[in-house]
């Protein structure tokens, strides 16, 4: 495939998992999608962190609209030379994108790890942190959390979609600056009727 | 097979203090929720606290809150219990129990309990 | 705190009867996330308590089908089906929904 199609294949794809991660983590802000938790102090460290907001989302969202750019055609100075230009960007942009992916994981992972913030017999705290993830194997206990209502399976859900939204942005990233170096140096594969003139 | 052996129980003066331990064997004691639960000489049951599987958190009733410490070993399968200003009223049978679970939950193992009395 | 209460304090039974008995706390039991955690334990002479039942209606392993719990809200009841010589003892019901947990006062199962 061309670096140029590839290119823009790989930036959809992030920009669609950027639009996951907000929401996930939109989400995560509203357990059992009540809002009266929103303002106290009864949700998770993780879920204030927003990785999925600004790690796999803002951070991500850079090399997915640079990716889709280098996969363009014009606009940054005319045909090879504008689109090595754009390939560059998006190297830089790339990498950009796999900081912010591995800070989503390494939140989200953290967040499925130590479980959520709960009231568990009348005590405010991370009452799964203890089990060291062991808790995700057993659901009987998940219903000893009194409040936020349901939250155990929200936060595991969510932050379990975090972290795959998030591997699989490290692995797009990763795929898009190998993509892009190579386009850096041998330009792009398409013909010269299809450059603008 | 799960085996809870308990130790430490004896006489002591009314203010005194105890440790009772409880030594597990037969299970990973490091992913079960434990508790002490005592039987007064009227054969009433009475929980006196809790701890979870790591240790990070314990639960008490009012009676017995600040006086006695719930402590676990993981590394060491066992469990404690360190009872100060002891009263008349925590005369006896004391009892170390799993819970089915990191937290609380039902007592599916108990110990053979270990008599504590208080008095002058 | 919630205080149960258990009738009657001895039920005296013949073999091979059914024995019923009554467990009642003074504010329900139901825990916020739907489930009642109500237990049933028995505690047979010179022996620990031995779980018998757990959230409300069931039986631990190994426990007999003879064996059954009911009831919702404050109203609890074990019933055992057909009474056999090694079902005797002292029977308590416990809550733990709410700290803190309570057990009952115990009802003494014993041959008429």
């Known amino acids: 495939m061309c670096t140029g199609k590839c290119a823009r294949c790989v930036g959809l794809s992030l920009i669609t998992l950027c639009l996951v991660c907000i929401v996930a983590n939109a989400l995560l802000l509203v357990p059992n999608g009540e809002t009266s938790w929103t303002n106290t102090n009864h949700l998770s460290l993780q879920v204030w962190l927003m990785g999925g907001f600004i790690g796999g989302g803002l951070m991500v969202l850079c090399p997915g609209i640079a990716a889709v750019r280098a996969g363009g055609k014009g606009c940054c100075g005319a045909g090879c030379c504008g689109n090595r230009c754009r390939m560059l960007r998006s190297v830089f942009s790339s990498a950009f994108g796999v900081l912010g992916a591995i800070y989503c994981l390494s939140v989200s992972g953290a967040g499925l790890r130590n479980g959520p913030r709960c009231l568990m017999n009348g005590e405010w705290g991370y009452h799964f942190e203890d089990t060291a993830g062991a808790y995700l194997l057993n659901r009987t206990l998940w219903d000893r959390c009194e409040a936020p209502p349901r939250v155990v399976p929200w936060n595991v859900t969510l932050f379990s979609l975090l972290v795959a939204a998030s591997c699989l942005e490290i692995v797009l990233c990763g795929i898009q600056l190998v993509n892009a170096t190579i386009g850096v140096f041998c330009g792009d594969c398409r013909k010269k009727q299809d450059t603008p003139h | 097979q799960v085996q809870l052996e308990q130790s430490g129980g004896d006489l002591v003066k009314p203010g005194g203090s105890l440790k009772l331990s409880c030594a597990a064997s037969?299970?990973?004691?490091?992913?079960?929720?434990m508790s002490w639960v005592r039987q007064t000489p009227d054969k009433r049951l009475e929980w006196v606290a809790t701890i979870s599987s790591g240790g990070g958190y314990t639960y008490y009733p009012d009676s017995v809150k600040g006086r006695f410490t719930i402590s676990r070993d993981n590394a060491k399968n066992t469990l404690y219990l360190q009872m100060r200003s002891l009263k008349s009223e925590d005369t006896a049978m004391y009892y170390c129990?799993?819970?089915?679970?990191?937290?609380?939950?039902?007592?599916?193992?108990w110990g053979q309990g270990t008599t504590l009395t208080v008095s002058s | 705190d919630i205080v149960m209460t258990q009738s009657p304090l001895s039920l005296p039974v013949s073999l091979g009867d059914q024995a019923s008995i009554s467990c009642r706390s003074s504010?329900?039991?139901?825990?916020?996330?739907?489930?009642?955690?109500l237990e049933w334990y028995l505690q047979k002479p010179g022996q620990s308590p031995k779980l018998l039942i757990y959230k409300v209606s069931n039986r631990f392993s190994g426990v007999p089908d003879r064996f059954s719990g009911s009831g919702s809200g404050t109203d609890f009841t074990l019933k055992i089906s057909r009474v056999e010589a090694e079902d005797l003892g002292v029977y308590y019901c416990?809550?733990?929904?709410?700290?803190?947990?309570?057990f009952g006062s115990g009802t003494k199962l014993e041959i008429k």
């Open positions: 129990a799993r819970h089915e679970g990191f937290t609380t939950y039902y007592f599916d193992y």
């Open positions: 037969g299970f990973t004691f490091s992913s079960y929720g």
């Open positions: 416990f809550q733990g929904s709410h700290v803190p947990f309570t």
């Open positions: 504010q329900s039991i139901l825990h916020s996330s739907g489930n009642t955690y």
